[in-house]
Each structure stands twice: as C-alpha cells, then as structure tokens.
C-alpha cells in the first residue's frame, strides 16, 4: 500500500512540477523593472524568455518577440535550452510513469518491468527538475550581475542637470514559479525512485532446508522473504503441513499480476 501511495504521490507531485515548469517557461515575467528608484513610473517593463513587454499606466500593454536567434545573449539561449530540456524530459517521464503506475493494469506487465519504468521516470523527473532549477538560477544570476552593473552607472548626466535613469531589472514571478516547480519535480522524481525499490522483486530466494521430526512431518521454512506490497497471498513464510520435505520453489507464490488498488 505504501509503495503504491508513494508512487502515486510522486506522479502527482511531478505532474504539478512539470506543469509549473511549462508555465514558468511561457511566462513573460522572468525579469521585471525595479521600481526602487522610480516608484512612480507610468511605464512598466518586464521580460520573458521569448519576448519583452511594456505596460503603460493607461492600461495598454505591448509585447515584442525576440525575432532573432543569433543576436540574443548566450546565457538566455542556455536558459531556454535548459527549460526546454526540462520540459521534454518531464513529459517523457510522465508518459513512462503513467504505464509504470501500480494501480494501472497494462496487459501482463511484470512488476519488475513496472519497477524499471518507475525508476526511469523518477530519474527523468530528477533531471527535469534539476534542469529547471539550473535554468532559473542561471537567469537569476544574470539578473543580479546586470543589476549591480547598472547600479554602478545609474545616472549619466549632462552637466549634472539632466538625469537619465537607467532601467534596472529584478526577479520576476516566473523565477519563483520555476524554482518551486523544479523543486516539486525533483521531489516527485525522488519519490518515484523510492517507490521503485518497493516494487522491485528481489531474486535472492534461499532454498528451504527440511527437518524431519520424528512425530509429524512438519517442514519449517526459513527466510526467503520478498519485498511485498501486502497484496495477494504470501505463503513464503507459512508452515507447510505435509508428509514430505519440499523446497521453497515448489510452493512459491508471487503476488497476483491483476491486483488493483
């Protein structure tokens, strides 16, 4: 039960995380105009990975796409790449994890196959989350660097009379969405990996040794425990009351392939 819950929760958390990564990637507010030195501006600037926007206090907003690839900063291209890789890996991970879910029956898929798929999707989620966190962090670092550079030459004057205020940019909402979403995807991936351990059948089954008692023929079966989900019959650690000695292989019962949660 715990394994199924962990797997299901991991899937849901990852799903929310990837939705957040997609939302963050599409958002225009990666960087927003810093209003500290000009809180009364009638024009507000903000920028995303794909376009920059200007919102006038009159309510009109104008957005312009970055219609060039070569003219964009390498860092911005890198952030775009990281976010897209994160989304692609996350999407593939979601697809794989749907088939890996223990509560979903697909043909005669073995638990070992489901365990492998769960692990694969978990790793994909972890990498996806790391890509998103890395992308957002690189962009944030770029903002911090540019912020202090523009602070250094904040005012350029003509004879000290005319002021030209340079626009500074600070963290936008998309950065926080990206960090949280990346974190959730990462957590979801870890949960999937944990769930995988519970799903994987252990192959180290020990042969049972039979002891013949003088009275009744009772075979005591030691060890040979498998990780069990608690579903289906499990006779591996029961006493076998019969007349002869038997190895465990003869009575081994695997959990049913057709269990539902």
């Amino acid at each position: 039960m715990a394994v199924t819950a962990c797997q299901g929760l991991g899937f849901v958390v990852s799903l929310i995380g990837i939705a957040g990564i997609i939302a963050a990637t599409c958002m225009d507010q990666w960087s927003t105009q810093d209003l500290y030195n000009n809180p009364v501006t009638a024009v507000f600037n903000y920028q995303g990975l794909w376009r920059s926007c200007v919102r006038e206090s009159s309510g009109f907003t104008e957005c312009r796409g970055y219609f060039t690839l070569l003219g964009l900063p390498a860092m911005l291209q890198a952030v775009r790449a990281l976010m897209i890789v994160g989304i692609v890996l996350g999407a593939i991970g979601l697809l794989v994890s749907i088939f890996a879910l223990k509560c979903i029956r697909i043909g005669s898929m073995e638990d070992s196959a489901k365990a492998n798929m769960t692990l694969t999707s978990g790793i994909m989620f972890i990498v996806s989350g790391l890509c998103a966190i890395a992308g957002v962090s690189v962009f944030a670092n770029m903002l911090v660097t540019n912020f202090w550079m523009s602070t250094a030459n904040m005012y350029t004057g003509m004879g000290g009379m005319v002021q030209t205020v340079q626009t500074r940019y600070t963290f936008g909402a998309a950065l926080f969405v990206g960090w949280v979403a990346g974190g959730l995807t990462l957590i979801g991936g870890v949960m999937m990996c944990i769930a995988c351990r519970g799903l994987a059948p252990e192959e180290t089954n020990y042969k049972a040794v039979s002891y013949h008692a003088s009275g009744h023929s009772v075979a005591y079966k030691p060890g040979g425990f498998k990780a069990s989900t608690g579903f289906g019959s499990n006779t591996k650690n029961k006493k076998i009351y019969d007349g002869g000695a038997r190895t465990e292989d003869e009575v081994q019962s695997y959990p049913s392939k057709h269990d539902y949660v």
Partner: antibody, heavy 118, light 113 residues
C-alpha cells in the same frame, strides 16, 4: 463617438468644497482611466489625479496634499472630482480627460470653471 | 517631479511658413523597454479644451494633419508645423507621460505674423 460632458460652472467661498462631475459616453467607461486636469488663468495645465472605473483604483498628484478625491459611478458612467479646503488659487477651469495609449489624454471634457471668491 | 520647459513662449510666423516649438525635460523620457519616448503634444485653441496631436514623441493621432510632426529623444523634443495655416493659431503644450505626476510644459503661443 466618445463624449465627456462636465457639470456647470461653480462659485465657491474659500474653505468650502466643490464636486465636479464628468459623464462619459460612446465607449466602455470601465475600461479606461479617467483623469482630472486643471488650468488656472495664465497658468500651465496641471494634472490632479486619475481613477480606473473598473475597480476604483486611484492615483493622485501629491502637490494637492490630499485635498483631491476622485470617485466614480459606473452605473451612470460618471466620474467625480472633489476638491476641498478651497483657496483663491484654486480658481481654474477643471477638465476630465480619458487616458489612452502612450499615457496621453485623447478625449477631453468641455471644462468646468470653478471660481473661489469671498 | 519632471520639469518640462518649452521655448519660445510665443512664436509669430507667416502663413505657409515653418514653425518649430522646443520642449526640454529635466529627465529622460525614453523608455528602454520599447525604445519609445513618452512625450505628448497638445494644441489648445482659445475657449476650448486641449486636443491631442502627437504621442510617443512622433506618432500622430488619427485625424491630425500631416503638417504636424514630432521629433526628438531622451530630453530634447521638437514639434514642427511644416506650413502654418490660419487654423493653427493656438497654444501648444508638451507633456511628460513617463513618470507620475504627469506634468505639462508652460505652453508656446503660435500667432500669424
């Protein structure tokens, strides 16, 4: 077509208050900021403040030290500007004006002359 | 507050001549986000409210004759009437549309010589 019709001229005593109305027609009143601008005789135009009828959000010119209150009645498509503690320097023509792209005033009311005299 | 300074205070031109009005702001009105200058020009005839002529320093409002043109960037702006007509007699104001409070220039009166 867009029209902004203001209330009639007023004569007030110093210390009193005046409330000028501006009825809008020909456009979606709730979707555009409404501004108030005044022009004292021989003086430059002076922006007083603005209101967004959609949610009642307001911005004011601090030079009026809280004497200006701008309100609206969306059902009547009307904006109001109240100026309190009137002084003789407040004698001016008061205009309402719609805020448009480029943060400019594209349509203006005909103006309301407010005379402050003892 | 941004201070808007217009020059000259008044201007007398002959019909058909060019008229040039200058406006200087105490702070740059250029927005880096869209490379637009937030400066507006208005025309006010006697007994009438102001009328919008040009916004974004150089964009003519609909219905404004093309003899009116705006230019300039940053802190220095110009309104040019290429061929003055009798109906252009008015006071012309520039306005800062970049920072609150929105401020106006002192006005330039255009008359016919």
């Amino acid at each position: 077509q867009v029209q902004l019709v203001q209330s009639g001229a007023e004569v007030k005593k110093p210390g009193a208050s005046v409330k000028v109305s501006c009825k809008a027609s020909g456009y979606a009143f709730s979707n555009y900021w409404m501004n108030w601008v005044r022009q004292a005789p021989g003086q430059r135009l002076e922006w007083m403040g603005q209101i967004y009828p959609g949610n009642g959000d307001t911005k004011y010119n601090g030079n009026f030290k809280g004497r200006v209150t701008i309100t609206r009645d969306t059902s009547a498509s009307t904006a109001y500007m109240e100026l309190s503690s009137l002084r003789s320097e407040d004698t001016a023509v008061y205009y309402c004006a719609r805020y448009y792209r480029g943060n400019c005033f594209d349509y203006w009311g005909q103006g309301t002359l407010v005379t402050v005299s003892s | 507050d941004i201070v808007m300074t217009q020059s000259p205070d008044s201007l007398a031109v002959s019909l058909g001549e060019r008229a040039t009005i200058n406006c200087k702001s105490s702070q740059s009105l250029l927005n880096s986000g869209n490379q637009k200058n937030y400066l507006t020009w208005y025309q006010q005839k006697p007994g009438q409210p102001p009328k919008l002529l040009i916004y974004w320093a150089s964009t003519r409002d609909s219905g404004v004759p093309d003899r009116f043109s705006g230019s300039g960037s940053g802190t220095d702006f110009t309104l040019t009437i290429s061929s003055v007509q009798a109906e252009d007699v008015a006071v012309y104001y520039c306005q800062n549309a970049y920072t609150y409070p929105l401020t106006f220039g002192g006005g330039t009166k255009v008359e016919i010589k």
